[in-house]
């Protein structure tokens, strides 16, 4: 019972993790700031991952795509990369774990792979979840490496002079909910991997016993106990019959044409 | 990089009209706010007209009702379009925009400028 709770747990901590993946990776907050120096309107700035948004005082808002790869940073495709792995993995994972639940039957798929099947769910939650941590702060430390970098140079060039405004840009909401996706995925996997264990076929609680044949009368019990005639008691619990019932770990590897299995 | 490219400047005769141009190229992902600024000889820059994306605009007291500002978010292009002209109008015409032109960065870029003369 509570490995199909931890199991049902892990699915559900990682399905939430993953929705919130795929949500971080979509929204537009992952960067912000207020452009207030400016003459005509307080412009509100954020980015996200695929385009980046301006909204004015007024309430207008305006989002430009990036539409080209070539001149984009090597971090952010790097950032939509780990962010794309981890969504596909988180995915996967979410396939192969709702076949994997020990409370759903399909066919007569034994436990064993059912075993096997969280625990391979475990670890794509595990490594989904790496990567949504990854990339999130991957593009954190972008943030702040760009501050550091931009201390209001002034250049000029073709076009006259440029000036690099030093702004902070804070952390936007995505970054927040990528972190926290993120961990609870790799909570989810963590949990199915432990699942896996208590999934895994149990060995028998006694030890298998082979049987010799024998002229006596020989009762077995099984369980480690010793076999005793029906002639007599022993009182003083001695091995009486040693030929009779032996464990597993007893038996000479040498076969007998008196041995029954 | 963030180039701008002013055109339209010159000599008019005063009641006259001149259209200035302004276009922006490089890496740009938002143009929030794209103005025009001037500066007589020994005066100080002052602001002639400024226009966010949505279109909110910003005149100088000196221009109101004689000067339009228009942008074309499109081209990443702005425009002023200066009727009326009087003498105390010539000055060096300067293009300034604000450029988100990367990730958690954006620049404040100025034109060369272009010469106006009312006379």
């Known amino acids: 019972m509570a490995v199909t709770a931890c199991q049902g747990l892990g699915f559900v901590v990682s399905l939430i993790g993953i929705a919130g993946i795929i949500a971080a990776t979509c929204m537009d907050q992952w960067s912000t700031q207020d452009l207030y120096n400016n003459p005509v309107t307080a412009v509100f700035n954020y980015q996200g991952l695929w385009r980046s948004c301006v909204r004015e005082s007024s309430g207008f808002t305006e989002c430009r795509g990036y539409f080209t790869l070539l001149g984009l940073p090597a971090m952010l495709q790097a950032v939509r990369a780990l962010m794309i792995v981890g969504i596909v993995l988180g995915a996967i994972g979410l396939l192969v774990s709702i076949f994997a639940l020990k409370c759903i039957r399909i066919g007569s798929m034994e436990d064993s792979a059912k075993a096997n099947m969280t625990l391979t769910s475990g670890i794509m939650f595990i490594v989904s979840g790496l990567c949504a941590i990854a990339g999130v702060s991957v593009f954190a430390n972008m943030l702040v490496t760009n501050f550091w970098m931009s201390t209001a140079n002034m250049y000029t060039g073709m076009g006259g002079m440029v000036q690099t405004v030093q702004t902070r840009y804070t952390f936007g909401a995505a970054l927040f909910v990528g972190w926290v996706a993120g961990g609870l995925t790799l909570i989810g996997g963590v949990m199915m991997c432990i699942a896996c264990r208590g999934l895994a076929p149990e060995e028998t609680n006694y030890k298998a016993v082979s049987y010799h044949a024998s002229g006596h009368s020989v009762a077995y019990k099984p369980g480690g106990f010793k076999a005793s005639t029906g002639f007599g008691s022993n009182t003083k619990n001695k091995k009486i019959y040693d030929g009779g019932a032996r464990t597993e770990d007893e038996v000479q590897s040498y076969p007998s044409k008196h041995d029954y299995v | 990089q963030v180039q701008l490219v002013e055109s339209g400047g010159g000599l008019v005769q005063p009641g006259g009209s001149l259209r200035l141009s302004c276009a922006a190229s490089?890496?740009?992902?938002?143009?929030?706010?794209m103005g025009w600024y001037r500066q007589a000889p020994g005066k100080q820059r002052e602001l002639v007209a400024g226009?966010?994306?949505?279109?909110?605009?910003n005149y100088g007291d000196s221009v109101k009702g004689r000067f339009t500002i228009s942008r074309d978010n499109a081209k990443n292009t702005v425009y002023l379009q200066m009727n009326s002209l009087k003498p105390e109008d010539t000055a060096v015409y300067y293009c300034n925009v604000l450029v988100i032109s990367g990730i958690g960065s954006h620049l404040e870029v100025w034109g060369q400028g272009t010469l106006v003369t009312v006379s």
């Open positions: 226009i966010s994306t949505g279109g909110t605009t």
């Open positions: 490089g890496t740009i992902f938002n143009i929030p706010v």
